[in-house]
């Protein structure tokens, strides 16, 4: 039950996070005009990863896309790439995790397969979240650097426009959305990895099997296992028989890859 809840919560948190990463990537307000030096400006500038916008006093808003690819700064390209990689990984992770959900039955899929898929999606969410956080942080660093370089005719690094002294840019709403969304995706991924450990195949109770020796009759009783939490290795669960006979249900217990996160 706890495993299902952890997995379900991890999925929901990651879903919200990835939706946030997509929203942040599409938002125009990655950087907004700093009004500290010019609070009376009637023209408000803000810029995104894909276009820059100007909102005029009349209420008219004009946005222009960055139609050049080669003319854009490498940093901006890197941020775009990180965000897109984050979205793609997150989307694949979501797709995988849907099939991995314990509450959803798909044919005769074994728990081991679901555990593998849960771990895979968890790792994808973690990488997706890290990509988003990295992308937003790189952009934020770029803004901070440019903020203090507000000399006349400064190259802004955003669409290659000439910057006049009075226009400086500060953090936009998209940065905060991106940081929060990346964090949520990361948390969701960790939760999926934790849930995966609980989904790892456990050793089941053994059927009582009687072996008739030629001389006298010896019955081997099944071992009484301690209750397992689902976390950690089951190698400590000692069997109370010492016969060499093995049932078809008994599997040798080695630490699996799901035991260590």
């Amino acid at each position: 039950m706890a495993v299902t809840a952890c997995q379900g919560l991890g999925f929901v948190v990651s879903l919200i996070g990835i939706a946030g990463i997509i929203a942040a990537t599409c938002m125009d307000q990655w950087s907004t005009q700093d009004l500290y030096n010019n609070p009376v400006t009637a023209v408000f500038n803000y810029q995104g990863l894909w276009r820059s916008c100007v909102r005029e006093s009349s209420g008219f808003t004009e946005c222009r896309g960055y139609f050049t690819l080669l003319g854009l700064p490498a940093m901006l390209q890197a941020v775009r790439a990180l965000m897109i990689v984050g979205i793609v990984l997150g989307a694949i992770g979501l797709l995988v995790s849907i099939f991995a959900l314990k509450c959803i039955r798909i044919g005769s899929m074994e728990d081991s397969a679901k555990a593998n898929m849960t771990l895979t999606s968890g790792i994808m969410f973690i990488v997706s979240g890290l990509c988003a956080i990295a992308g937003v942080s790189v952009f934020a660093n770029m803004l901070v650097t440019n903020f203090w370089m507000s000399t006349a005719n400064m190259y802004t690094g955003m669409g290659g426009m000439v910057q006049t002294v009075q226009t400086r840019y500060t953090f936009g709403a998209a940065l905060f959305v991106g940081w929060v969304a990346g964090g949520l995706t990361l948390i969701g991924g960790v939760m999926m990895c934790i849930a995966c450990r609980g989904l790892a195949p456990e050793e089941t109770n053994y059927k009582a099997v009687s072996y008739h020796a030629s001389g006298h009759s010896v019955a081997y009783k099944p071992g009484g296992f301690k209750a397992s939490t689902g976390f950690g290795s089951n190698t400590k669960n000692k069997k109370i028989y010492d016969g060499g006979a093995r049932t078809e249900d008994e599997v040798q217990s080695y630490p699996s890859k799901h035991d260590y996160v």
Epitope: V40, V43, Y46, S58, G59, F60, E62, M161
Partner: antibody, heavy 119, light 113 residues
Framework: QVQLVQSGAEVKKPGASVKVSCKAS????????MHWVRQAPGQGLEWMGM????????NYAQKFQGRVTMTRDTSTSTVYMELSSLRSEDTAVYYC????????????WGQGTTVTVSS | DIQMTQSPSSLSASVGDRVTMTCKSS????????????LTWYQQKPGKAPKLLIY???TRESGVPSRFSGSGSGTDFTLTISSLQPEDFATYYC?????????FGGGTKLEIK
């Protein structure tokens, strides 16, 4: 057809207040800022401030801060400009204007309201 | 506040003449975000409300004859009437549309010679 119809001429005594109205028609009243501009006899144009009919948010020129109040009534699509503590130098023609350029919508101005401040 | 200075304050010309008037602002009206100059030109005839001619320093308002053209960037702007018509005799105002308050220039009165 867009129309801005202003109230009639006013004669006021110094120290009094005047409230000029501007009734809009032919467009979505709440979508555009309304500006107030005045012109003293034989003088140039002077921007007083603006109001957004939807939110009621205003922006006044520092010169008129504390003396001017711009309000709106969305039910009648009317904006009002009230100027208090009138002085003789407030004698002017007061215009309301719906300013929205940068699109297919042009500028529209009211016909003007003459306010005379005289003792 | 941004100060707007127009010159000359009055100008005499004949029908068919090419006329140029200037407007200087105390601060740059160029917005780096879209590389547009937020300067507007108005025409006003006696007893009438102003009429928008040009916005963004050089963009003609719809319905305004092509003989009117605006140019300039930053702090220096020009309004040119290529061939004066009788209906063009009026007062012309430039206006800062970049920062509050939206200050107007003193105006240039265009009279018949």
């Amino acid at each position: 057809q867009v129309q801005l119809v202003q109230s009639g001429a006013e004669v006021k005594k110094p120290g009094a207040s005047v409230k000029v109205s501007c009734k809009a028609s032919g467009y979505t009243f709440t979508s555009y800022w309304m500006h107030w501009v005045r012109q003293a006899p034989g003088q140039g144009l002077e921007w007083m401030g603006m109001i957004h009919p939807n939110s009621g948010s205003t922006n006044y020129a520092q010169k008129f801060q504390g003396r001017v109040t711009m309000t709106r009534d969305t039910s009648t699509s009317t904006v009002y400009m009230e100027l208090s503590s009138l002085r003789s130098e407030d004698t002017a023609v007061y215009y309301c204007a719906r300013r929205y350029y940068g699109s297919i919508s042009p500028d529209y101005w009211g016909q003007g309201t003459t306010v005379t401040v005289s003792s | 506040d941004i100060q707007m200075t127009q010159s000359p304050s009055s100008l005499s010309a004949s029908v068919g003449d090419r006329v140029t008037m200037t407007c200087k602002s105390s601060q740059s009206l160029l917005n780096s975000g879209n590389q547009k100059n937020y300067l507007t030109w108005y025409q006003q005839k006696p007893g009438k409300a102003p009429k928008l001619l040009i916005y963004w320093a050089s963009t003609r308002e719809s319905g305004v004859p092509s003989r009117f053209s605006g140019s300039g960037s930053g702090t220096d702007f020009t309004l040119t009437i290529s061939s004066l018509q009788p209906e063009d005799f009026a007062t012309y105002y430039c206006q800062n549309d970049y920062s509050y308050p939206f200050t107007f220039g003193g105006g240039t009165k265009l009279e018949i010679k």
